[in-house]
């Protein structure tokens, strides 16, 4: 089971209209450049077999991957949104640094790995798709962690 007290984000992190709006604007702009609408990264398959108490830990993994493998490499694109949204998401990642789960997290790692594999397989268009789903990442992170 997760060390649930550490797998929590305060509601106030998601009650900042300006950065929420910028995150959604960034997602909107990137989704216009996404020509692969058949694939969804953040959806039912990602959460399959994951209990309520494990969702935040899973989303922490997705957030960290998105930052390190997608947003940092693409940081020169989609300005001015990117330069505001990335530090915000990085702060959330930092706040979840002590979120771990005790015991087996293989099912979670397997689900996250499928997402990573999909992004990698699609190459740059996979990275654009991930940016285009930042609204879903934001909302899923909120719903899982508050």
């Amino acid at each position: 089971a997760p060390i649930s007290s550490h797998c929590r984000l305060d509601k106030s992190n998601f009650q900042q209209p300006y950065i929420t709006n910028r995150t959604f604007m960034l997602a909107k702009e990137a989704s216009l450049a996404d020509n692969n609408t058949d694939v969804r990264l953040i959806g039912e398959k990602l959460f399959h077999g994951v209990s309520m108490s494990e969702r935040c830990y899973l989303m922490k993994q997705v957030l960290n991957f998105t930052l390190e493998e997608v947003l940092f490499p693409q940081s020169d694109r989609f300005q001015p949104y990117m330069q505001e949204v990335v530090p915000f998401l990085a702060r959330l990642s930092n706040r979840l640094s002590t979120c771990h789960i005790e015991g087996d997290d293989l099912h979670i790692q397997r689900n996250v790995q499928k997402l990573k594999d999909t992004v990698k397989k699609l190459g740059e268009s996979g990275e654009i798709k991930a940016i285009g789903e930042l609204d879903l990442l934001f909302m899923s992170l909120r719903n899982a962690c508050i």
């Epitope: 953040i42 959806g43 399959h48 077999g49 994951v50 108490s53 909302m139 909120r142 719903n143 899982a144």
Partner: antibody
Amino acid sequence: EVQLVESGGGLVQPGGSLRLSCAVSGFSLSSYAMIWVRQAPGKGLEWIGIIDIDGSTYYASWAKGRFTISRDSSKNTLYLQMNSLRAEDTAVYYCARDRFVGVDIFDPWGQGTLVTVSS
Amino acid sequence: AVVLTQSPSSLSASVGDRVTITCQASEDIYTNLAWYQQKPGKAPKLLIYWASTLASGVPSRFSGSGSGTDFTLTISSLQPEDFATYYCQACVYGNSADSRYTFGGGTKVEIK
């Protein structure tokens, strides 16, 4: 094909008990949270409670103490135990699968089973 | 607990009409809203989630919009099979789990 079939409804006297069943096929109960929802005649939908993948249960405040959700994963069957039944518990009772996609969505639903509480 | 107020509670329309149903939440629910269709004697069926994402197999004449406290379900051109009752449903996280899921009172769409 995913299917949910409720059973166990019927006429029960006030103060009585009833156990409803929801037999599922096409997916494993151990991989999804499941909910119970009820609908009084001519009224709207009312959430009763949920059983999570790990077996944790959560109930609407009004249902706590009288209603208990459980499951038997080996039989792929969900249950709703209802005690101290009242006339106002008369309703169609539905089970539904909870698909978390970043937000909880209920899909699909069973066809429902009617519970009538009357003397 | 969040309260969802649907309006109108019922409406009469003709085949081909554009129909709009609103759902107002008593607090900010972001985009954590779904819409369900229920025909008489049948179980509810998921239409829309994330306020605007069409569920699999749902015709494109259905659309959803809104965020925060105000949401809309639109049927662009009403078909005979669309006469039913429509419910909005919210998920509220971060509070007690006993009030996480709430349904609106429903909107009955009848034949004019």
